[in-house]
Interface confidence: medium
């Protein structure tokens, strides 16, 4: 008996994995076990199937590959290397697949890969060469244009004895492979700081999402080189104030829109420059929603409604007069 056609353009097989580059390419109309395929849409979906490895028999036509909601654990080098290569694969979504390790060269041999989503994976071990593929000081340029790394921070007890921020940044900067990256999302990663060199080496960025982190200050971060930046998401961080240098850099970016909601702004004398800037600038979206969190007497006051008389600092007492 032959399979009957379905009204949907998706086909699938429903059988299971060992990893090897197959010498015999799959037939063009085949679909890997536990996946759904649409050749018309050039899409393969292997979603919520508890896969423990990337299917080896992916069809050569695949342009969009969804491997979300699985149990992949580790992406080895050449996880998507095939003969012939998956030359058309442009969008790869691996979110929520319990990945805790992405090894060097995991995305090698994907010449058209433009979008990669690794969100919601507890990446305790992200190789510095995960995206560049080699440890050369200058690697071949990656085709990646969008890199989505939201909520990839592992639980605290699973983190290596090193800075999580440093591990992620090392992968972003290795071999200068991501010079063409236009969108970078790093939301919800408990970042305490942003290493100062990261943005300078991603000159093509149009969209940067750092929302829902724990950033306290941007003092050592330079936005000067990001002349193409269109959106900067800094909502839901721990920012207390933006200082003059940062304000001037942001104002100097020709296309920028900045999002600053839900930060614990400290409305004391150090806030005066930022309040003045906010009143004049057009770059901050929803600036009328920004409110003070501290000191207590200023809580919930709207920043735009403050004047210099509101922004005072308690005098610093000499040590002999300070109370404990």
């Amino acid at each position: 008996s032959s399979p009957t056609s379905s009204a949907s353009s998706f086909s699938s097989s429903a059988p299971f994995l060992a990893s090897a580059v197959s010498a015999q390419p799959p037939l063009p109309d085949q679909c890997p076990a536990l996946c759904e395929c649409s050749e018309a849409a050039r899409t393969v979906k292997c979603v919520n199937r508890n896969l423990t490895e990337v299917p080896t028999d992916l069809p050569a036509y695949v342009r969009n590959l969804f491997l979300t909601g699985n149990q992949l654990a580790v992406l080895p080098a050449g996880a998507f290397a095939r003969r012939p290569p998956l030359a058309e694969l442009a969008a790869l979504n691996l979110s929520g697949s319990r990945l805790d390790e992405v090894r060097a060269g995991a995305f090698e041999h994907l010449p058209s890969l433009r979008q990669l989503d690794l969100s919601h994976n507890p990446l305790a071990d992200l190789s510095p060469f995960a995206f560049s593929g080699s440890n050369a000081s200058v690697s071949a340029p990656s085709p990646l244009v969008e890199l989505i790394l939201n909520h990839i921070v592992p639980p605290e007890d699973e983190r290596q004895n090193r800075s999580f921020e440093g591990m992620v940044v090392a992968a972003l900067l290795a071999g200068r492979a991501l010079q063409g990256l236009r969108r970078l999302e790093l939301a919800s990663n408990h970042f305490l700081y942003l290493p100062r060199d990261v943005l300078a080496q991603l000159p093509s960025l149009r969209h940067l999402d750092l929302s829902n982190n724990s950033l306290v200050s941007l003092t050592y971060v330079s936005f000067r080189n990001l002349t193409h930046l269109e959106s900067l998401h800094l909502e839901d961080n721990a920012l207390k104030v933006l200082h003059n240098g940062t304000l001037a850099e942001l104002q100097g970016l020709p296309h920028i829109r900045v999002f600053l909601d839900n930060n614990p702004w400290v409305c004391d004398c150090h806030m005066a420059d930022m309040v003045t800037w906010l009143k004049e600038t057009e770059v901050v979206q929803g600036k009328d929603r920004l409110t003070c969190a501290y000191p207590e007497k200023m809580r919930n006051r709207v920043l735009l409604e403050l004047n210099s008389a509101d922004l005072d600092c308690d005098p610093i007492l000499p040590p002999s007069l300070q109370t404990s």
């Epitope: 699938s12 429903a14 994995l17 090897a20 799959p26 037939l27 076990a33 759904e36 080896t56 028999d57």
Partner: antibody
Framework: EVQLVESGGGVVQPGRSLRLSCAAS????????MHWVRQAPGKGLEWVAY????????YYADSVKGRFTISRDNSKNTLYLQMNSLRAEDTAVYYC?????????????WGQGTTVTVSS | DIVMTQSPDSLAVSLGERATINCRAS??????????MHWYQQKPGQPPKLLIK???NLESGVPDRFSGSGSGTDFTLTISSLQAEDVAVYYC?????????FGGGTKVEIK
């Protein structure tokens, strides 16, 4: 006409090995994923193993993982199941079955089965 | 593993009457596009035979008195008018993930 014919069953002592074969005809064997399913005496069906059409992908039930190996020879239109370290609980009728190369459909053709008895 | 629970274990129905068999999966076996649930008939001394694929699609050559329905976790096989040749054990099976698992079977007899 699609035909699947299993062979290689028999009586074997615990800890020994056996190799089952499944000869396929009446369809393009190399286009189809293949399975082994077993049925213990008086019991229900238990899926055992799967191999993709080009032998690039294998899956096994936990109960046989590390002991059984599924393979195929597309040039001979034959599916195999190498069974090592056999146990009494492996006693069953073993069926080979075909699943379509694409589409989500179930096991559309089955062989008549071959009986494996593991007993000392 | 996904557990497939079939009910009832056995069923005695008069010739020409309706027989209904239920199968419940311990988690959803349907995507937004398909249901990965199939039904088989097994007569004594014979291998299983695919009756219904993907919840509701009748395999070619199967009489149209057989029908399947359901999605997510709950599925039903119905024989609208039981014939003598329908006496058999019926199994549901999912193909959502590894391992494929079968229900325990429902024995259908003539009352």
């Amino acid at each position: 006409e699609v035909q699947l014919v299993e062979s290689g069953g028999g009586v074997v002592q615990p800890g020994r090995s056996l190799r089952l074969s499944c000869a396929a005809s009446g369809f393009t064997f190399s286009n189809f994923g293949m399975h082994w399913v077993r049925q213990a005496p008086g019991k229900g069906l238990e899926w055992v193993a799967y191999i993709s059409s080009g032998s690039s992908t294998f899956y096994y039930a936990d109960s046989v993982k590390g002991r059984f190996t599924i393979s195929r020879d597309n040039s001979k239109n034959t599916l195999y199941l190498q069974m090592n370290s056999l146990r009494a609980e492996d006693t069953a009728v073993y069926y080979c079955a075909r699943s379509p190369a694409y589409y989500r459909y179930g096991l559309d053709y089955w062989g008549q089965g071959t009986t494996v008895t593991v007993s000392s | 593993d996904i557990v497939m629970t079939q009910s009832p274990d056995s069923l005695a129905v008069s010739l020409g009457e309706r027989a209904t068999i239920n199968c419940r999966a311990s988690q959803s076996v349907s995507s937004s596009t398909f249901s990965y649930m199939h039904w088989y008939q097994q007569k004594p001394g014979q291998p299983p035979k695919l009756l219904i694929k993907s919840s509701s699609n009748l395999e070619s050559g199967v009489p149209d008195r057989f029908s399947g329905s359901g999605s997510g976790t709950d599925f039903t096989l119905t024989i609208s008018s039981l014939q003598a040749e329908d006496v058999a054990v019926y199994y549901c099976q999912h193909s959502w993930e590894i391992p494929y698992t079968f229900g325990g079977g429902t024995k259908v007899e003539i009352k």
